[in-house]
């Protein structure tokens, strides 16, 4: 029972985590304009992995995609790759773990096969979570470096009186979503690996012994005895829901009719 709960919980936690990783990857707010010196701004800039956006105080939002591949910073490409790898591994892990769930019976699948699948999905979730955490951390490090660089030359004098203010960027909501989601996926993966140990059949393989009883010729061959869990048939007729995760890139104070690309 505890094994099933651990496996089920691991699956749910991983599912939430992967939904979060997908959400974070799609979000536009990976980096947001630093408002430390000016909390009320007429033009607010924020950037994602795929496009950069500008929200005007008028409520209009303009987003522009990064329509170049070679012109983008290598670090950004690396972050994209890590997040996509994380999503792919996580998605495969989810697919594998669905069939590995103890509460779902598929034909006459052995518990040993389910244990192996649980372990495989668990490892996939762990790697997926690590990819997401690594991707977000690389981006955060890039932000910190750029932040202090832009702070060093915040104001560039142009002909004495005229000033050019350099826009500084700080951590966006997507980074926190990514960190939390990566952590959840990692935890879910660990739980699946723990559940795998409980699922693995503890086989006591006795040597085949023939007992000859006088008058009867009956041979007993004790093999791998498996403990029945009672979850063989779906007696409760449980439904398995595949919950789709809906992601919102940002909360805007204006309806989407003001948004244009």
């Amino acid at each position: 029972m505890a094994v099933t709960a651990c496996q089920g919980l691991g699956f749910v936690v991983s599912l939430i985590g992967i939904a979060g990783i997908i959400a974070a990857t799609c979000m536009d707010q990976w980096s947001t304009q630093d408002l430390y010196n000016n909390p009320v701004t007429a033009v607010f800039n924020y950037q994602g992995l795929w496009r950069s956006c500008v929200r005007e105080s008028s409520g209009f939002t303009e987003c522009r995609g990064y329509f170049t591949l070679l012109g983008l910073p290598a670090m950004l490409q690396a972050v994209r790759a890590l997040m996509i790898v994380g999503i792919v591994l996580g998605a495969i892990g989810l697919l594998v773990s669905i069939f590995a769930l103890k509460c779902i019976r598929i034909g006459s699948m052995e518990d040993s096969a389910k244990a192996n699948m649980t372990l495989t999905s668990g490892i996939m979730f762990i790697v997926s979570g690590l990819c997401a955490i690594a991707g977000v951390s690389v981006f955060a490090n890039m932000l910190v470096t750029n932040f202090w660089m832009s702070t060093a030359n915040m104001y560039t004098g142009m002909g004495g009186m005229v000033q050019t203010v350099q826009t500084r960027y700080t951590f966006g909501a997507a980074l926190f979503v990514g960190w939390v989601a990566g952590g959840l996926t990692l935890i879910g993966g660990v739980m699946m690996c723990i559940a795998c140990r409980g699922l693995a059949p503890e086989e006591t393989n006795y040597k085949a012994v023939s007992y000859h009883a006088s008058g009867h010729s009956v041979a007993y061959k004790p093999g791998g005895f498996k403990a029945s869990t009672g979850f063989g048939s779906n007696t409760k007729n449980k439904k398995i829901y595949d919950g789709g995760a809906r992601t919102e890139d940002e909360v805007q104070s204006y309806p989407s009719k003001h948004d244009y690309v």
Epitope: Q33, N38, V40, T41, A42, V43, N45, Y46, Q47, S52, C53, V54, E56, S57, S58, G59, F60, E62, R64, M158, V162, Q163, T164, V165, Q166, T167, S253, Y254, P255, K257, H258
Partner: antibody, heavy 118, light 113 residues
Framework: QIQLVQSGAEVKKPGASVKISCKAS????????MNWVRQAPGKGLEWIGN????????TYNHKFKGRVTLTVDTSTSTAYMELSSLRSEDTAVYYC???????????WGQGTLVTVSS | DIVMTQSPSSLAVSLGERATINCKSS????????????LTWYQQKPGQPPKLLIY???TRESGVPDRFSGSGSGTDFTLTISSLQAEDVAVYYC?????????FGQGTKLEIK
């Protein structure tokens, strides 16, 4: 079409307060911030502040902070600007103006003349 | 606050001729996020509220004749009327839309020579 209709002219004594209204029509009132701009006779334009009708949150020009109060009544699609401790230099035409792309003001009220005289 | 300085303060141009009004800001109005300049041009005729001509320094508002054009980037901007018409006689203002408080230039009075 979008229309901004302002209240009539006001004559006030120094130290008094004035409250001007701006009734919006032709669009969803809460969709756009309302800006307030003034123009002294024969002078240039001066931005007073703006208000987000959806949240009721105002942004003021620090020059007027403490003296100006921007409010909205969403039920009547009306924006209000109240200016207190009036001085003779506050004599001006006060405009309400809607926001557009680029933070520009594409729609303006007809203006309200406020005269501060003892 | 960003200071907007217009030049000249008044301008007399013959009908059909080109009119050029300059506007200089004390800080760059170029937003790095979308590479747009947050400068707006308005036209104001006596007894009327200002009329929006150009936003984002060079984008003409719908319904504005194409003889009006805006150019410039960063701190230096120009409003050009390619062929002056009688109805163009007005005061022209530039405005900083980049940071609060929004500030206007002192205005340029355009007359017919």
């Amino acid at each position: 079409q979008i229309q901004l209709v302002q209240s009539g002219a006001e004559v006030k004594k120094p130290g008094a307060s004035v409250k001007i209204s701006c009734k919006a029509s032709g669009y969803s009132f809460t969709d756009y911030h309302m800006n307030w701009v003034r123009q002294a006779p024969g002078k240039g334009l001066e931005w007073i502040g703006n208000i987000d009708p959806y949240y009721g949150s105002p942004t003021y020009n620090h020059k007027f902070k403490g003296r100006v109060t921007l409010t909205v009544d969403t039920s009547t699609s009306t924006a209000y600007m109240e200016l207190s401790s009036l001085r003779s230099e506050d004599t001006a035409v006060y405009y309400c103006a809607n926001y557009g792309r680029g933070n520009s003001f594409p729609y303006w009220g007809q203006g309200t003349l406020v005269t501060v005289s003892s | 606050d960003i200071v907007m300085t217009q030049s000249p303060s008044s301008l007399a141009v013959s009908l059909g001729e080109r009119a050029t009004i300059n506007c200089k800001s004390s800080q760059s109005l170029l937003n790095s996020g979308n590479q747009r300049n947050y400068l707006t041009w308005y036209q104001q005729k006596p007894g009327q509220p200002p009329k929006l001509l150009i936003y984002w320094a060079s984008t003409r508002e719908s319904g504005v004749p194409d003889r009006f054009s805006g150019s410039g980037s960063g701190t230096d901007f120009t409003l050009t009327i390619s062929s002056l018409q009688a109805e163009d006689v007005a005061v022209y203002y530039c405005q900083n839309d980049y940071s609060f408080p929004f500030t206007f230039g002192q205005g340029t009075k355009l007359e017919i020579k």
